[in-house]
């Protein structure tokens, strides 16, 4: 005979679950589907990941997202995790927002980002709900810098980047400071491939770095080079 009252709790159908913290009166729910739409937009050494919520929330509102990263070397095709070498705009696990920026990406590397959607019952199943997006980083190569000449009060510096990349550069930024003086530095911008740094102290080592500026932002910075002006007993303007 049918019971005069409804049951206080029901067993869940296959594929539906109650999380341990769910009250017995709560409906059965299931894990969400994958994030609906994922884009990865590269900007120099950064990527902005954006996605839309799963079309099927599984009947729950406690959806969070996790982002993982894999990098691949184009020459060998070998791949590996890159969590240790990139920086996220916020912790990449337990995200509630639907976007994140990943920075400190390496030039000429291929990256695959996986965004997984989870809710309170995702831990009760082995399957995962995720979407992936790949991006290649085409940040400009670091400039190769040379000391062309020096005097007691100046350093003449030149640099180069591969010709195919030169058209992307609108200016170069040259940063320099006295060695041992980390509190102040000077910046020069130029459209050419060389600069003469004037009004320097004699017999002094300067740290010099060159960075390309592109429409997408900053290119990779050159090595920090150490160049030394001539001592007063050194003569004239010597080429190196």
């Amino acid at each position: 005979l049918p019971s005069p009252e409804g049951a206080t709790s029901c067993e869940c159908e296959e594929g539906f679950f109650r999380a341990p913290q769910d009250p017995a009166s709560m409906p059965c729910t299931r894990p969400p589907s994958a994030p609906h739409y994922l884009t990865a937009v590269g900007m120099g050494a950064k990527v902005e990941l954006r996605w839309t919520p799963p079309q099927d929330s599984g009947g729950r509102e406690d959806i969070v997202y996790s982002v993982t990263c894999e990098q691949c070397w184009p020459e060998s095709g070998e791949c590996g995790p890159c969590e240790a070498s990139v920086r996220y705009s916020e912790p990449p696990h337990g995200l509630t927002r639907t976007s994140v920026t990943v920075s400190d990406l390496e030039p000429h590397m291929n990256y695959t980002f996986t965004v997984e959607a989870r809710n309170g019952v995702s831990g009760l199943v082995t399957s995962r709900s995720f979407r992936t997006a790949s991006v290649s980083i085409n940040q400009t190569e670091p400039p190769k810098v040379r000391l062309e000449g020096r005097s007691t009060t100046s350093l003449s510096v030149s640099w180069s980047i591969p010709p195919p990349q030169q058209s992307r550069v609108w200016k170069y930024e040259v940063t320099y400071r006295k060695k041992g003086d980390s509190n102040s530095y000077n910046v020069r911008r130029t459209e050419g491939f060389s600069v003469t740094l004037d009004d320097l102290a004699p017999d002094t080592t300067y740290l010099v770095q060159v960075q390309a500026l592109t429409q997408e932002g900053q290119g990779a910075g050159s090595k920090v080079h150490e160049f030394q002006t001539l001592s007063p007993e050194g003569s004239g303007n010597l080429a190196v």
Partner: antibody, heavy 127, light 108 residues
Framework: QVQLQQWGAGLLKPSETLSLTCAVY????????WSWIRQPPGKGLEWIGE???????NYNPSLKSRVTISVDPSKNQFSLKLTSVTAADTAVYYC?????????????????????WGQGTMVTVSS | SYVLTQPPSVSVAPGQTARITCGGN??????VHWYQQKPGQAPVLVVY???DRPSGIPEQFSGSNSGNTATLTISRVEAGDEADYYC???????????FGGGTKLTVL
């Protein structure tokens, strides 16, 4: 070919002063900054500091208050002194030569790679 | 102060390729040097300036450096490559030299 030969006391008591000397044979002593590096048993390498022929020094900030590196250019030698030693200073101590002269034609190489190392001196601090 | 982070250990089968990483903030703007050290011996320089090899070091040792990671790659690994490997840079902001913590390479 440059060779480095080092010597000094191998057993010290806590609070004593460690003293090591490194002699450079061959090459141009005045062109380089010469370094001391240590390695505690089973642990990694730690740079102690460096000196050039005229006595200009750089020290690891974590050891700076206890370290003195000195030079005797007439003998092509440089020395390390580390005061107030404790058991934590127990290590193999190496002297080392950088790969390239410090400055050549205005281009300088601070913290260059080390291509030649001394044989190492095991220093034990124990009461 | 500047910190270099290396994995404590890397294992690889003979004939395979080993990659040992060295992480540091903007390490790509610094010259990275790599050493091999076998038990009871002084370190030996195997790569300098990111990717150059001193004379006498075999071609199987190569290096790269960009962004926040430098990598020492040992191709066709053999039993004799089992050792500790250290990266090294000069930190120009503090004017001192820094070693990574070291990575023990085990050949399976």
């Amino acid at each position: 070919q440059v060779q480095l030969q080092q010597w000094g006391a191998g057993l010290l008591k806590p609070s004593e002063t460690l003293s090591l000397t490194c002699a450079v044979y061959g090459g141009s002593f005045s062109d380089y900054y010469w370094s001391w590096i240590r390695q505690p048993p089973g642990k990694g390498l730690e740079w102690i500091g460096e000196i050039n022929h005229s006595g200009s020094t750089n020290y690891n900030p974590s050891l700076k208050s206890r370290v003195t590196i000195s030079v005797d250019p007439s003998k092509n030698q440089f020395s390390l002194k580390l005061t107030s030693v404790t058991a934590a200073d127990t290590a193999v101590y190496y002297c080392a030569k950088p790969f390239r002269p410090h400055c050549t034609n205005g281009v300088c190489y601070s913290g260059d790679a080390f291509d030649i190392w001394g044989q190492g001196t095991m220093v034990t601090v124990s009461s | 102060s500047y910190v270099l982070t290396q994995p404590p250990s890397v294992s690889v089968a003979p004939g395979q390729t080993a990659r040992i990483t060295c992480g540091g903030n903007n390490i790509g703007t610094k010259n990275v040097h790599w050493y091999q050290q076998k038990p009871g011996q002084a370190p030996v320089l195997v790569v300098y300036d990111d990717s150059d090899r001193p004379s006498g070091i075999p071609e199987q040792f190569s290096g790269s450096n960009s962004g926040n990671t430098a990598t020492l790659t040992i191709s066709r690994v053999e039993a004799g490559d089992e050792a500790d490997y250290y990266c090294q840079v000069w930190d120009s902001s503090s004017d001192h030299l820094v070693f990574g913590g070291g990575t023990k390479l085990t050949v399976l």
